[in-house]
């Protein structure tokens, strides 16, 4: 089974990519 | 508590440039976007751009580019707007705002506001 | 660019009675993955800045008064006033954040 393009709902944010606004949001951060 | 204080207010001659700037302090200045919305006199707010100043990616709208730059500095935790090419119709009030960026999108704190005034 | 519209842009109101205000956009506003709809309402009080009050179309914000509540999906928007007080008077805009930023044009409520 291959995770690596799971991302983390609770990790830091330091690989948050800027995206114009929230329709390109795949989930939301807390 | 985040807050978010500007600039003082500029008076300025149409062609020239103007920038504004926005201190950020009480938050991760780089955890959030920084957009910035005028207001010209008796009028609604318009968004002209934002920026992330963790990677200082930018959007802005489309009615302003190339004449708006926005930047950041993440050492001072303060943002700027810079906007060249200044005529009469770009007197009005620019805020800051913190603009919630990941979860609400949306515009929790802002700045107390610059009047930029363009005459001859 | 999606277009934000607002109506009425001015809303005489009588303290203690309801007030609404509609919004529409050009296109919806919900992102089916997140399930969320990115529409926000703002209140710019007379001589002041804006203030968030609701998010996500119908989540308010913290420290706003429950008489505010937002509401609809997709296009259509609705923010609801359920007993206008004194305090409320000011400008109401509505604001999208799906793709970039648009405000609609503003809602002027004053006390009649």
């Known amino acids: 089974l291959d995770l690596s393009n799971v991302q983390s709902k609770c990790g830091s944010k330091d690989n948050i990519k800027h995206v114009p606004g929230g329709g390109s949001v795949q989930i939301v951060y807390k | 508590q985040v807050q978010l204080v500007q600039s003082g207010a500029e008076v300025k001659k149409p062609g020239s440039s103007v920038k504004v700037s926005c201190k950020a302090s009480?938050?991760?200045?780089?955890?959030?976007?920084i957009s910035w919305v005028r207001q010209a006199p008796g009028q609604g707010l318009e968004w002209m751009g934002e920026?992330?100043?963790?990677?200082?990616?930018?959007y802005y709208n489309e009615k302003f580019k190339g004449r708006v730059t926005i930047t950041a500095d993440k050492s001072t935790s303060t943002a700027y707007m810079e906007l060249s090419s200044l005529r009469s119709e770009d007197t009005a009030v620019y805020y800051c705002?913190?603009?919630?960026?990941?979860?609400?999108?949306?515009?929790?704190?802002w700045g107390q506001g610059t009047l930029v005034t363009v005459s001859s | 660019d999606i277009v934000m519209s607002q109506s009425p842009l001015s809303l005489p109101v009588t303290p203690g009675e309801p007030a609404s205000i509609s919004c529409k956009s050009s296109?919806?506003?919900?992102?089916?993955?997140?399930?969320?709809?990115?529409l926000a309402w703002y209140l710019q009080k007379p001589g002041q800045s804006p203030q968030l009050l609701i998010y996500?179309?119908?989540t308010r914000e913290s420290g706003v008064p429950d008489r505010f509540t937002g509401s609809g999906s997709g296009t259509d928007f609705t923010l609801k006033i359920s007993r206008v007080e004194a305090e409320d008077v000011g400008v109401y805009y509505c604001k999208q954040s799906f793709y970039l930023r648009t405000f609609g044009q503003g809602t002027k409520v004053e006390i009649k």
């Open positions: 996500w179309a119908s």
């Open positions: 296109q919806s506003l919900l992102n089916s993955r997140t399930r969320k709809n990115y």
């Open positions: 009480g938050g991760i200045f780089s955890d959030y976007v």
């Open positions: 920026i992330f100043p963790r990677s200082g990616s930018t």
């Open positions: 705002a913190r603009d919630y960026y990941g979860t609400s999108f949306a515009m929790d704190y």
